[in-house]
């Protein structure tokens, strides 16, 4: 490969244009930051391949490594690659931006690392500091790479001066993990048991052939020793397991169980602990509260959820009006109880496309041989209001009446309003609210009926208008917690011959 200009380091002017050429006996390509920038590839008559990379309007951000490499399916040797480093001194760019990955450096052992703070100008003096200190650290700097050395578990920043302006880099964080070469995990078949049941714990070590297990447990403190069993898990390399089994647990066996593992070759050790609770008898406890009145909206789906703790696992039943519920074949009701942790459960009743008939008294009961709990609530089905009728009449008494009838659940409120200027109202002028005002212009009479079978309220409201001297748009609006509906009618004076 032949690169012109050959480098290996170039310093170019900001805003300038520069051409890099690479040629070779096979197809060649320029790479920048693991990508191929736009370039012109050609093949000469003598069989030489070339690629021309034109860098236009250069800025400091063009500073960095450029590689020319063979672009050949024959897979030529990887060392057949030329590196060129370009600086574009740019006073507007302090330190070159880093990817997030470069700001965090993770180590497990003492080894040389590089803090990759780079500038656009190879003439700049760059110093390294602990983030909390001013003293420059005596670490060698390479303008193309950054500071390389052995670093403590601290945070660092680089500093430089551009003109008369001091510039700081982003902070770099060195994380050193003091790794134990032993990885221990402890788990229990159950962390909650009843007295008389068994406690079984497992301590597993990975990646070590020769280890020693030592268990600490409440019974041991009273001098009652239990002999653990150690085995090798054959399906996994070097997984060694120690099993501690305590039959017929007593209340005094509650407490912390610790597995300590030592490896004598490198004198490493690690330990993990787990808490075991022995209860006198099983329990079921509700967690959180569910209000005694719940709501669902007609034709929408509603999930009612109860969270509880129990040991041992309970049976869960749901009832509606004292009749047992089950998953319906039509898919209208779905029941599920999930075990979300060892002793925590979530039971859900889902009503699909709720119907009026599903209002009623619901109970969830969770029980086993030792305990039970139940939770009850009333389910109200909310029905959006609708205006069923809006009619106008003018009896002989001379007044005119408008009757509005509608239904909904919960009980709808009724609002009467009128517009006298039909051209401008309601867009430009707000409608006037009507009702039992001190002026005797209008009177209102409203009756409410609850229909037991449909489980909703019916509102009938009659508006009496004393004298109507010009056409009037009267609007009846019904509103409740889940919606509103409006209808309007034009009321004309008696004197007008048309309606």
């Amino acid at each position: 490969l032949v690169v012109t200009p050959p480098g290996p380091e170039l310093v170019l002017n900001v805003s300038s244009t520069f051409v890099l050429t690479c040629s070779g006996s096979a197809p060649v390509v320029w790479e920048r930051m693991s990508q191929e920038p736009p370039q012109e590839m050609a093949k000469a008559q003598d069989g030489t391949f070339s690629s021309v990379l034109t860098l236009t309007n250069l800025t400091g951000l063009d500073t960095g490594e450029y590689f020319c490499t063979h672009n050949d399916s024959r897979g030529l040797e990887t060392d057949e690659r030329k590196r060129l480093y370009i600086f574009v001194p740019d006073p507007t760019v302090g330190f070159l931006p880093n990817d997030a990955e470069e700001l965090f450096i993770f180590l497990t052992e003492i080894t040389e690392i590089t803090i990759p703070c780079r500038v656009t100008d190879p003439q700049l003096v760059v110093t390294l500091h602990e983030k909390k200190g001013d003293v420059a650290l005596p670490v060698p700097y390479d303008h193309q790479r950054g500071f390389s050395g052995i670093f403590e578990d601290r945070s660092y920043i680089c500093k430089t001066t551009i003109g008369d302006r001091e510039v700081d880099s982003d902070a770099y964080y060195v994380y050193r993990l003091q790794v134990s070469s032993i990885n221990v995990s402890v788990n229990a078949v159950q962390t909650v048991v009843r007295q008389g049941e068994n406690i079984t714990l497992m301590c597993i070590v990975i990646g070590n052939e020769v280890v020693n297990f030592e268990w600490t447990y409440p019974r041991k403190e009273s001098g009652r020793l239990v002999e653990p069993v150690t085995d090798f898990l054959l399906d996994m390399p070097y997984h060694i397991r120690s099993i501690l089994h305590i039959p017929s647990a007593e209340l005094e066996d509650s407490g912390t169980y610790t597995c300590n593992v030592t490896e004598s070759v490198n004198d490493h050790q690690d330990e993990k602990a787990i808490n075991i609770t022995v209860v006198e008898s099983g329990y079921v406890r509700l967690l959180g509260e569910v209000g005694t009145l719940q709501f669902a909206e007609l034709h929408r789906s509603r999930t009612l959820q109860v969270v509880f703790e129990a040991y041992p696992p309970p049976t869960v039943l749901w009832f509606k009006d004292n009749r047992t519920l089950g998953d319906s074949s039509a898919g209208e009701i779905a029941l599920s109880t999930r075990n979300v942790s060892e002793t925590r459960y979530v039971s859900e009743l889902t009503l699909v496309r709720v119907k009026v008939a599903e209002a009623g008294h619901y109970t969830m009961r969770a029980f086993h041989e030792d305990a039970e709990v139940q939770l009850s609530f009333q389910l109200q089905i909310n029905v959006p209001v609708r205006v069923l009728e809006l009619s106008e009449s003018h009896p002989d008494s001379g007044e005119q009446t408008v009757r509005c009838r509608g239904r909904g659940m919960p009980q709808p409120n009724i609002i009467w309003s009128a517009c006298r200027d039909l051209k401008r109202c309601p867009r430009e002028l707000p409608p006037t609210l009507l009702g039992n005002s001190s002026e005797e212009e209008s009177q209102l009479e409203t009756n409410v009926t609850y229909w037991e079978e449909e489980q909703e309220f019916e509102v009938v409201s009659t508006l009496r208008l004393q004298h109507v001297d010009r056409p009037l748009s009267v609007r009846c609006t019904l509103r409740n917690a889940v919606g509103q509906d409006t209808q309007e009618v034009i009321v004309v004076p008696h004197s007008l011959p048309f309606k």
């Epitope: 993770f106 909390k132 601290r154 945070s155 964080y173 060195v174 994380y175 050193r176 993990l177």
Partner: nanobody, 116 residues
């Protein structure tokens, strides 16, 4: 004293997901990023990404994008890392870590074993 305590070991089947928790104490949880790093048996440390507990903003290493989620619950000072579509080469000890400026602080590690 800053401290991070992680959830216990997990054994999962290929294709499953695992969610590891990391509870912080001894400092203001929202002041420092939480990093997630893993170490497979016999390998070095591999950075997975970070979460800013203050805003909930995250940044993931390209290798894990689309497969990892990092969340936090500031009410209980806990960060979570969930890795989905587990493969056998995801068997590793997963660590959370944070940096107090003067030094780093690490969780005790959570061993995740992926085995059919």
């Amino acid at each position: 004293q800053m401290q991070l305590v992680q959830s216990g070991a997990e054994v999962k089947k290929p294709g499953a997901s695992v969610k590891v928790s990391c509870k912080a104490s001894g400092y203001t949880f929202t002041d420092y990023y939480i990093q997630w790093v893993r170490q497979a048996p016999g390998q070095g440390l591999e950075w997975m990404g970070w979460i800013n507990p203050d805003s909930g903003g995250t940044y993931f290493a390209q290798k894990f994008q689309g497969r990892v989620a990092m969340t936090r619950d500031t009410s209980i000072n806990t960060a979570y890392m969930e890795l989905s579509s587990l493969r056998s080469d995801d068997t590793a000890v997963y660590y959370c870590a944070t940096h107090g400026g003067d030094r780093s602080y690490w969780g005790q590690g959570t061993l995740v074993t992926v085995s059919s």
